[in-house]
Interface confidence: low
C-alpha cells in the first residue's frame, strides 16, 4: 500500500474541524502578475508581500505594484501601498530585509529615465512606516547590509561606483570608482575589486583587490592580477592570474588579506572555474572544474588554514552552462553533505558523505522501494536525489532537498531508486537519521515544508490542475492526513512558512482564474490546534546520531565526537513550540586514523584508512607555499580533520619547517602592499 494508507496509521482526532477554524483566506485586490514575499524579523509574524503587474503599452511598459503587510503570520493582510506613495517597486532588487531582528526594510523604486538618481523607501520599524530617500546614484545591485551593523549599507551604481551609507540609507557617499564586485567582510570591513583600464570584463585577471576597514576613509590594496574573490567562513579567497600564462590559482588569507598563501589546488585555465561549495570557520569545500566542457570537476576539502587540500570526490557534477550543482549541506545532521557525480557513461548518481567529505558513498536503497529500469540488478541499487540540476533540466521536480537544523535528522527530497537518476516522475523520500536510511514518503512529486521543528510535515501535490487539498503528517512522514482547505481549487504557486521551521503556520499561495479576471489568493493554516498540548519530557527519546553499529564502541563517532539528541517520538502529537531548542549531549571519542586527512603529498587508497605517499612525489621534498614563504613539510602523511575534536588514541607526527625562501607566487607579498587614505 502507499505510504500512510496502511492500517497502522491512526488518524489525528477531529482535525478537519480544528483546521477549518484555523484556515484564513486572503484574496488580493490585484491582477495577477508576480508576487514576492518576505519575512521581516524572526518570530515577529510580520510578512511583506509585493505584487507587481506589467501592462505592455505600444511604446513602453507600464508597471504597477502593491505592498501588503501582515503581522499575524499571513492570516490577514493590509494594503500599505500608500506608505510608499503608490510607487512602482523594482522586483529585481527584491525587498532588502535587515539582518537579525533589526526590523529594517529597503525597497528600491522604479524612477523615470531622466532622473539624477534612484529612489528607495526605508523602514526601521518592521514596515509600519517608510521614509522616501532620493539617491545620488542609480543602483546596480540591491542594498547590502553590514552583518555587524544594520545601519551600514553598501551598493554599486550603474556607473561602477561603490557607495556607502552609515545612517541606514539616509545619506550616501561614493568611496571608490571603477568597482566590479564588493562584499562585506567581518568587523564592517569591505572588500572590493577595481579595474584600471577599460571595464570589469576587459580587466578580468588584472583587477586589484582592495580593502577598507573604516567605511572608505582609508584603503589598502591587498592583491593584484585578480580574476575574482570570495569569502567563506573565516577565509578570504582570490583567484590570481599566473605570471607566464593564462592560468590562475587560488590564494587564501585568514587575516583579512594582510598575508596570503597559495592554496595547494590545481591551477585552472580560461574556460575553467573554482567554486566555494561550502565553508565554515573550520574548513572549505572547493570545487575545481576539469579542463574542457566536461560538466564535472573535483571536490577538495581544506585543512584548517584553507591551504592544504585533500581530494574528496572525483567527477563532481557542476555544469558550466548555467552553473548547476547538486551540492547540498544537510543542515539537520553535522557532517552530512549530498551531491551528484557524473559517471563514465554520463549517467548521474547521488553520493553522500557523513564525515564532512572524508568518504562518499551511495545512498542506501529505501526498504519500501524497488529498483527502477536504470538498475542492472533488480535487487541492488541506490536512491538518487533530484536537486538543482534536475530542476534546471525541467524534470518534474518542484523542490530541492529540504533539511532544517532544528528538525534533527530529517531530510526530505525527490528521488528515484536505481543505478542513476531517472528522468521518470520522481517520488518523495524521507530520512529520519540524516541520510543513512530512507523511506518513500509520498508517491509522485510534491511541495513540502517542515513546521514546528519537525513536529509537522506539510505537503501539496505538484499538479498542473488547480488544487484544494493539503497533506500533513505528525509522525515524520509515516502517516498522512488530507485536508480540503477550500471548496474552490486554486492554481497553486507556492508554499510559504517562516524560515527556521519553528512556525505552525503554513501559507498556500496561488491564483484563481475566472472568465475575466485572475487574482492572487493565499490560505494560511495554523496547525496549533492539531498539536493541542506542549511536548513534555516523556514525548522525547534519546537518539545517537551517526549510529550505524550499536555494538561498536566508536559507534556515532564523527569528527572526533558523538552526539546524543533528545528527539520527539514519532507517536507523540504535541507542540515543540517556538522556543524549542535542540538538546544534545556531546562526548569526545579517542582518535583513530579516521580523524585524520591525508597530508599534502599523500592519499588514501580506496577502502583503506592508511595514507600512502603519492607515487609522483615519492622521494621528493614536500614543499609548499605559506604566507609567501616556502615551507618544508615533515609528515607521516596525516593531519587532523578541521573541526575534529577527538583526543588520545592515534597521534601521527607532523612538523612544518620554514625554508626561508620566497614562493614563486606572483601575488603581492605583504611588504609590497600599499595603503592610502581618502
Amino acid at each position: 500500500s502507499a505510504p500512510g494508507e496502511d492500517e497502522e496509521c491512526g488518524r489525528v482526532r477531529d482535525f478537519v474541524a480544528k483546521l477549518a477554524n484555523n484556515t484564513h483566506q486572503h484574496v488580493f485586490d490585484d491582477l495577477r502578475g508576480s508576487v514576492s514575499l518576505s519575512w521581516v524579523g524572526d518570530s515577529t509574524g510580520v510578512i511583506l508581500v509585493l505584487t507587481t503587474f506589467h501592462v505592455p503599452l505600444v511604446i513602453m511598459t507600464f508597471g504597477q505594484s502593491k505592498l501588503y503587510r501582515s503581522e499575524d503570520y499571513g492570516k490577514n493582510f493590509k494594503d500599505i501601498t500608500d506608505l510608499i506613495n503608490n510607487t512602482f517597486i523594482r522586483t529585481e532588487f527584491g525587498m532588502a530585509i535587515g539582518p537579525e531582528n533589526s526590523g529594517k526594510v529597503v525597497l528600491t523604486a522604479e524612477v523615470s529615465g531622466g532622473s539624477r538618481g534612484g529612489r528607495i523607501f526605508r523602514s526601521s520599524d518592521f514596515a509600519k512606516n517608510f521614509v522616501q530617500t532620493d539617491l545620488p546614484f542609480h543602483p546596480l545591485t540591491q542594498m547590502m547590509y553590514s552583518p555587524q551593523n544594520s545601519d551600514y549599507l553598501l551598493a554599486l551604481s550603474t556607473e561602477n561606483g561603490l557607495w556607502v551609507s552609515k545612517n541606514f540609507g539616509g545619506k550616501w557617499e561614493e568611496i571608490h570608482k571603477a568597482v566590479c564586485l564588493a562584499k562585506w567582510g567581518s568587523d564592517n570591513t569591505i572588500f572590493f575589486t577595481t579595474y584600471a583600464n577599460g571595464s570589469c570584463k576587459a580587466d578580468l585577471g588584472a583587477l586589484e583587490l582592495w580593502r577598507t576597514s573604516d567605511l572608505g576613509k582609508s584603503f589598502k590594496t591587498i592583491g593584484v592580477k585578480i580574476y575574482s574573490f570570495g569569502l567563506g567562513g573565516r577565509f578570504l579567497f582570490a583567484s590570481v592570474m599566473a605570471d607566464k600564462d593564462t592560468t590562475r590559482r587560488i590564494h587564501v588569507s585568514t587575516d583579512q588579506g594582510d598575508t596570503w598563501s597559495m592554496a595547494q589546488l590545481p591551477s585552472v585555465g580560461q574556460e575553467q572555474f573554482y567554486s566555494i561549495l561550502a565553508a565554515n570557520d573550520d574548513m572549505v569545500f572547493m570545487h575545481v572544474d576539469e579542463p574542457g566542457d566536461t560538466g564535472f570537476g573535483t571536490i577538495f576539502t581544506s585543512d584548517d588554514r584553507g591551504i592544504v587540500y585533500s581530494k574528496s570526490l572525483d567527477r563532481h557534477l557542476y555544469t558550466t552552462t548555467g552553473g548547476e550543482t547538486d551540492f547540498t549541506n544537510v543542515t539537520s545532521l553535522r557532517g552530512v553533505y549530498i551531491t551528484s557525480v557524473l559517471s563514465e557513461d554520463n549517467s548521474i548518481q547521488t553520493m553522500i558523505t557523513f564525515d564532512q567529505g572524508g568518504r562518499w558513498t551511495h545512498l542506501r536503497k529505501p526498504e519500501n522501494s524497488e529498483c527502477d529500469a536504470t538498475a542492472k540488478n533488480k535487487n541492488e541499487c541506490s536512491l538518487h536525489i533530484h536537486a538543482s540540476y534536475s530542476i534546471s533540466q525541467k524534470l518534474n521536480v518542484p523542490m530541492a532537498p529540504l533539511s532544517e537544523p532544528n528538525a534533527v535528522g530529517i531530510v526530505i527530497a525527490h528521488g528515484s531508486v536505481g543505478d542513476a537518476i531517472s528522468v521518470m516522475v520522481p517520488d518523495v523520500y524521507i530520512s529520519d537519521d540524516g541520510g543513512y536510511s530512507w523511506t518513500k514518503m509520498l508517491e509522485g512529486p510534491h511541495y513540502y515544508t517542515i513546521l514546528d521543528s519537525g513536529g509537522i510535515i506539510v505537503a501539496i501535490e505538484h499538479s498542473s490542475r488547480p488544487i484544494n487539498v493539503i497533506k500533513f503528517s505528525t509522525d515524520e512522514g509515516q502517516c498522512w492526513q488530507t485536508y480540503t482547505f477550500t471548496r474552490d481549487p486554486i492554481y497553486f504557486t507556492g508554499l510559504a512558512s517562516e524560515p527556521g521551521a519553528r512556525s505552525m503556520n503554513i501559507s498556500i499561495w496561488g491564483f484563481t482564474e475566472s472568465f475575466l479576471t485572475s487574482q492572487w489568493v493565499s490560505y494560511t493554516i495554523d496547525f496549533k490546534d492539531i498539536l493541542e498540548r506542549n511536548c513534555e519530557e516523556k514525548d522525547y527519546t534519546i537518539w545517537l546520531a551517526h549510529s550505524t553499529d550499536p555494538e561498536d564502541y566508536e559507534d556515532g563517532c564523527i569528527l572526533g565526537y558523538k552526539e546524543q539528541f533528545l528527539r520527539l517520538r514519532k507517536s507523540s502529537v504535541c507542540q515543540n513550540g517556538r522556543d524549542y531548542v535542540v538538546t544534545k549531549q556531546p562526548s569526545i571519542c579517542l582518535c583513530s586514523l579516521e580523524d585524520f586527512l591525508c597530508d599534502f603529498g599523500y592519499y588514501r587508497p580506496e577502502n583503506d584508512s592508511k595514507c600512502v605517499e603519492q607515487p609522483e612525489l615519492k622521494g621528493h621534498d614536500l614543499e609548499f607555499c605559506l604566507y609567501g614563504r616556502e615551507e618544508h613539510l615533515t609528515t607521516n602523511g596525516y593531519r587532523k580533520i578541521p573541526g575534529d575534536k577527538c583526543q588520545g588514541g592515534v597521534n601521527p607526527v607532523r612538523e612544518v619547517k620554514d625554508l626561508k625562501k620566497k614562493c614563486t607566487s606572483n601575488f603581492l607579498s605583504p611588504e609590497k602592499q600599499n595603503s592610502k587614505s581618502n
Epitope: E551, D552, C557, S587, S592, V650
Partner: antibody, heavy 129, light 107 residues
Framework: QVQLVQSGAEVRKPGASVKVSCKAS????????MSWVRQAPGQGLEWMGI????????SYAQKFQGRVTMTRDTSTSTVYMELSSLRSEDTAVYYC??????????????????????WGQGTTVTVSS | EIVMTQSPATLSVSPGERATLSCRAS??????LAWYQQKPGQAPRLLIY???TRATGIPARFSGSGSGTEFTLTISSLQSEDFAVYYC?????????FGGGTKVEIK
Amino acid sequence: QVQLVQSGAEVRKPGASVKVSCKASGYTFTKYYMSWVRQAPGQGLEWMGIINPIGGSTSYAQKFQGRVTMTRDTSTSTVYMELSSLRSEDTAVYYCARDPSGIAAAFPAGRYYYGMDVWGQGTTVTVSS
Amino acid sequence: EIVMTQSPATLSVSPGERATLSCRASQSVSSNLAWYQQKPGQAPRLLIYGASTRATGIPARFSGSGSGTEFTLTISSLQSEDFAVYYCQQARLGPWTFGGGTKVEIK
C-alpha cells in the same frame, strides 16, 4: 613502566555489591579504553564491558547489563568496576585490561584491533553465604 | 553475539615440536582477533593482535594467521615455558568474546 594495579581480594555475601579498582600508571590514562574480564575457577575468560576514560561512556555485555557499573576518575587515573546483586556464580578473578581498541581506525574493511596489551594482576572476589 | 570456538580443547605436544591451534568465529571478524597466553595463577598475556601481528616482546616462534572466520596460532618449536592455556578473542562487534581456550600440555 606501564602497569595496572588492582585492589585486594574481597569476600561478599549473596545479594551484596563489590567495587574493584584498577589504577593505571606509566602511560596517558585517557589514551586507552579499559576492559574488564573475569575468570571463574577452572573456567575460561569472560568479557564484561569497556569504558572510554575520556567521556566515561561505557558498553556492557548483555549478561551483566543492569548489574555492572564502570566508572573512572581521571584525576587519579583509576577505573572502577562495581557488580551488584552478587550470586555464588560471580565468584571469580576479575581483571582490568588496557584495551587500545579506541585507537582503531573504523573503515569499511573493519577496524584494526590491537588486543588487550596490559593486564592487572587480578582481584579475587568470593561470594559465599 | 559472535561465538568463538577453539579446537582442540587440549593439545599434547613434545618440546621442540610444532603446535597448531585453531579458532573459528561464528561470523566474520575480519582481522580483529587477538591471541592470549595464560599460565596458572597469572593474568593473560597478549601474544598476537590484528590476527597476525606479534605483540611487543613476543618471540618469533609465535605466529598468527587467518582472516574472516578461520584463524590459526602456530608455535613453531615449543619451549618449556610455552605450556599454558591459549585463548583467542574477537573485537569486531561488541560484546568482545573469547574462545573456550586450548590447553597445550607436555606429551
